[in-house]
């Protein structure tokens, strides 16, 4: 997150981290039920660990943290390259969470976000637009949903209904490492960090997010059948 601020501890209890090896964070994720996470399809890796209830970027133990393995990764069947449509993936964890003030699921928005809606994006991704500067703790950033027209003008021929744009204030954006993390609007999960230009946080190059309102049925059906 570029030019965000430290999240309040436990203010994003649905925020998850996907880890490679012992503790190399490579993507964000979102807890949507006691045993299921959502993340971006482009975050798919064969082996990873899941960390919930953690505030710090470092692997230091925190009392609220819970660690899990992913036992099933189910990317949306329509995820495609190079267009990046349908950029979402369900992860089933090896057990259910212990519900606590640090770890709670978030409800997915059934209605699509409208232009001007204020939302919050969070993550442990790089805090510099073009270099690797990682934060000490989870970062939060208020962003505004942009019109479909403005989104398509920013990225001609690259936006479809499975995406929405948000942000666009120069110097403020999600960035590398935030992928798969939550965009929460009015207390409901509206999107996932999907993609954007490099360097991050350029004028008229907003962040692009997976438009989860388009996938409520697929998410429910997939969880029920697995």
């Amino acid at each position: 997150i570029v030019n965000g601020s430290d999240c309040q501890k436990d203010a994003q209890p649905w925020q998850g981290a996907l880890l490679l090896g012992p503790n190399k964070l490579y993507c964000g994720a979102v807890l949507i039920s006691p045993q299921w996470l959502l993340t971006a399809a482009h975050c798919r890796k064969p082996v990873f660990r899941i960390r919930l209830g953690h505030h710090s970027m470092s692997p230091v133990y925190e009392s609220g943290q819970q660690m899990f393995q992913g036992i099933k990764s189910i990317p949306h069947p329509g995820y495609s390259h190079p267009g990046h449509s349908n950029d979402l993936m369900l992860i089933k964890m090896n057990r259910k969470i212990r519900d606590s003030h640090s770890v709670k699921p978030v409800e997915i928005a059934c209605d699509c976000a409208t232009e001007g809606t204020r939302c919050m994006v969070s993550g442990w991704g790089t805090t510099s637009s073009s270099h690797n500067n990682f934060p000490k703790v989870l970062q939060c950033l208020n962003i505004t949903v942009l019109s479909e027209e403005r989104c398509k003008n920013s990225y001609p021929g690259q936006i479809d209904k499975t995406m929405f744009c948000a942000g666009d204030e120069e110097g403020r954006d999600s960035c590398q490492g935030d992928s798969g993390g939550p965009v929460v609007c009015n207390g409901k999960l509206q999107g996932l960090v999907s993609w954007g230009d490099f360097p991050c946080a350029q004028r008229n190059r907003p962040g692009v997010y997976t438009n989860l309102c388009e996938f409520v049925k697929w998410i429910k059906d997939t969880m029920n059948s697995n």
């Epitope: 490679l20 190399k24 490579y26 971006a40 399809a41 482009h42 390259h81 190079p82 267009g83 990046h84 950029d87 991704g125 790089t126 073009s130 270099h131 690797n132 021929g157 690259q158 999600s174 960035c175 590398q176 490492g177 935030d178 992928s179 960090v193 999907s194 993609w195 954007g196 230009d197 490099f198 991050c200 692009v208």
Partner: antibody, heavy 127, light 108 residues
């Protein structure tokens, strides 16, 4: 300012293994943001991608060379290496190492342009 | 594999001329197309990335356009130092990363 420098033997015998190293100076090879790439150019011909490695150690190889290629990173020495086994005269080329800079973040991070190159090293395969 | 076809393979032009080189992909690559310049005995140099973005330090007489399958590199007013070979390159999620065959720009 980032600089890349290839090193290794200029002459390799047929059927042997070609080994090259690229030393990165002026920046960290363990950066999350970049790919590290090997490309070659046979005499008088165009550019051919050999393979790449990313921050997590994931490798991507040209399918036409995959069975013979290994790319690895040594973060402690800020180097990445190429090994090409069972070489023939057709592997004679100028070998370049380069940095792949992503064209975006997130799903776009897998697409990149080579923005910094080594000067190249000539490898001849001959007995 | 995605094939990249460059045309022409060579061209002769004079200083001050407007030069256009085209590159066609065998399937859509969105805007993931880069252009390089290579002079004899030297490593390639990145000119344009993401189809139309000018690499830092590259003169503004170079420009790129296109998306999907058809792309163009334009040199608005050819300078003596621009005589070189130009390559397009598609940047893949799935390997292989491929280059066009090159366009040699020679002095008329």
């Amino acid at each position: 300012q980032l600089q890349l420098q290839e090193s290794g033997p200029g002459l390799v015998k047929p059927s042997e293994t070609l080994s090259l190293t690229c030393t990165v100076s002026g920046g960290s090879i363990s950066s999350l943001d970049y790919y590290w790439v090997w490309i070659r150019q046979p005499p008088g011909k165009g550019l051919e991608w050999i393979g790449s490695i990313d921050y997590s150690g994931d490798t991507y190889y040209n399918p036409s060379l995959k069975s013979r290629v290994t790319i690895s990173v040594d973060t402690s020495k800020n180097q990445f290496s190429l090994k090409l086994s069972s070489v023939t005269a057709a592997d004679t080329a100028v070998y370049y190492c380069a940095r792949g800079r992503p064209l975006g973040y997130g799903a776009r991070h897998y697409y990149y342009a080579m923005d910094v190159w080594g000067q190249g090293t000539t490898v001849t395969v001959s007995s | 594999d995605i094939q990249m076809t460059q045309s022409p393979s060579s061209l002769s032009a004079s200083v001050g001329d407007r030069v256009t080189i085209t590159c066609r992909a065998s399937q859509s690559i969105s805007s993931y197309l880069n252009w390089y310049q290579q002079k004899p005995g030297k490593a390639p140099k990145l000119l344009i990335y993401s189809a139309s973005s000018l690499q830092s330090g590259v003169p503004s007489r170079f420009s790129g356009s296109g998306s999907g399958t058809d792309f163009t590199l334009t040199i608005s007013s050819l300078q003596p130092e621009d005589f070189a070979t130009y390559y397009c390159q598609q940047s893949p999620y799935f390997p292989p990363l491929t280059f066009g065959g090159g366009t040699k720009v020679e002095i008329k």
